[in-house]
């Protein structure tokens, strides 16, 4: 049950994360005009990965797409690429994870196959989340660099009297959406990987062998060095690690190095 819950939650968290990454990528507010000393502005500028917009005091908004590829900064192209890779990986991960969900039965799919698919989708979510976080962070770094550069030459004199006010840009809403979404996708991926461990049928290289002593039998289990008295169900030659499918409600106790008597 815990495995199913972890897997299901991982899927939902990743789904929300990827939706957020898509939303952030499409948003126009990656950078917004810095309203330093001027909270009310007649013309408000903001920019996204695909277009830049201007909103006037009337509410009239005009957006212009970046209709060039070669003319754009390499960093912007890199951010676009990272976000798209993140979306593609996330989408594939979602597709894979749907089939991997324990609560969904597809033909006679083995648990081992579901475990592998869960792990695959988990890794994809992790990489997707990292791509989004990296993309947003690169853009944020670019903004910080440009911000201080434009602050240094805020007013560039032109012929003494005339001044050109440089528009400074600061973090837009899309950056925060991207960071949160990337984090959620990453967390979802980790949860899927954790769920995979619970799904995977554990196999040992050894069969458990019972050594029959003259008095009463003691079964030595190679996995965990845990002695068991011969009374009860463990007196037969029985594999301690059952390779068969477990029910999802089964509480599995794995031997560990601390499990000794």
């Amino acid at each position: 049950m815990a495995v199913t819950a972890c897997q299901g939650l991982g899927f939902v968290v990743s789904l929300i994360g990827i939706a957020g990454i898509i939303a952030a990528t499409c948003m126009d507010q990656w950078s917004t005009q810095d309203l330093y000393n001027n909270p009310v502005t007649a013309v408000f500028n903001y920019q996204g990965l695909w277009r830049s917009c201007v909103r006037e005091s009337s509410g009239f908004t005009e957006c212009r797409g970046y209709f060039t590829l070669l003319g754009l900064p390499a960093m912007l192209q890199a951010v676009r690429a990272l976000m798209i890779v993140g979306i593609v990986l996330g989408a594939i991960g979602l597709l894979v994870s749907i089939f991997a969900l324990k609560c969904i039965r597809i033909g006679s799919m083995e648990d081992s196959a579901k475990a592998n698919m869960t792990l695959t989708s988990g890794i994809m979510f992790i990489v997707s989340g990292l791509c989004a976080i990296a993309g947003v962070s690169v853009f944020a770094n670019m903004l910080v660099t440009n911000f201080w550069m434009s602050t240094a030459n805020m007013y560039t004199g032109m012929g003494g009297m005339v001044q050109t006010v440089q528009t400074r840009y600061t973090f837009g809403a899309a950056l925060f959406v991207g960071w949160v979404a990337g984090g959620l996708t990453l967390i979802g991926g980790v949860m899927m990987c954790i769920a995979c461990r619970g799904l995977a049928p554990e196999e040992t290289n050894y069969k458990a062998v019972s050594y029959h002593a003259s008095g009463h039998s003691v079964a030595y289990k190679p996995g965990g060095f845990k002695a068991s008295t011969g009374f009860g169900s463990n007196t037969k030659n029985k594999k301690i690690y059952d390779g068969g499918a477990r029910t999802e409600d089964e509480v599995q106790s794995y031997p560990s190095k601390h499990d000794y008597v």
Partner: antibody
Framework: QVQLQQPGAELVKPGASVKLSCKAS????????MHWVRQRPGQGLEWIGM????????NYNGKFKSKATLTVDKSSSTAYMQLSSLTSEDSAVYFC????????????WGQGTSLTVSS | DIVMTQSPSSLTVTAREKVTMSCKSS????????????LTWYQQKPGQPPKLLIY???TRESGVPDRFTGSGSGTDFTLTISSVQAEDLAVYYC?????????FGSGTKLEIK
Amino acid sequence: QVQLQQPGAELVKPGASVKLSCKASGYTFTSYWMHWVRQRPGQGLEWIGMIHPNSGSTNYNGKFKSKATLTVDKSSSTAYMQLSSLTSEDSAVYFCARGGYYGNSLDFWGQGTSLTVSS
Amino acid sequence: DIVMTQSPSSLTVTAREKVTMSCKSSQSLLNSGNQKNYLTWYQQKPGQPPKLLIYWASTRESGVPDRFTGSGSGTDFTLTISSVQAEDLAVYYCQNAYSYPFTFGSGTKLEIK
């Protein structure tokens, strides 16, 4: 058609206050900023400030911040500007103007109220 | 605040003549985001309120005759009347529409001979 109606003239004594009105019609009052502009006799235009009827949010020219107070009455589609502590310097024609949709322009103007401050 | 300087302060021309008037701003009115200049021109006839002629430095308001043309960018702007008519007798004001507080030029008075 868009109309901004203002009373023709107001006569007030120095030190008093006056509330100038501007009744809008022919458009959705709450969708556009309302600006106020002053023109002293034989002089140019000075922007006083603006108010958004929907939100009530205002933006003043620093020069008029302590002099003018902008308000609106949505029910009657009327904008008001209260001028306080009046002196002869405040004698001027006061225009209300609708903020245009494009270019931060002022696209429709009232006829103006001629304010005379005299004892 | 942005200071708007208009020149000349007055102009006397004959009908059907071409006239140009200048407006300079102390700061650039060009917005980098959309490459538009936030300068507006108004016409004020005697005893009337101002009337919007041109916004974005060169876009004519609907109903404004095409003899009125706005041009310029950054800090230097011009209003041209290609063929002056008697009804064009007025004071012409330019206005900074880029940043608050909005500021107006002192006006150019156009007189017809």
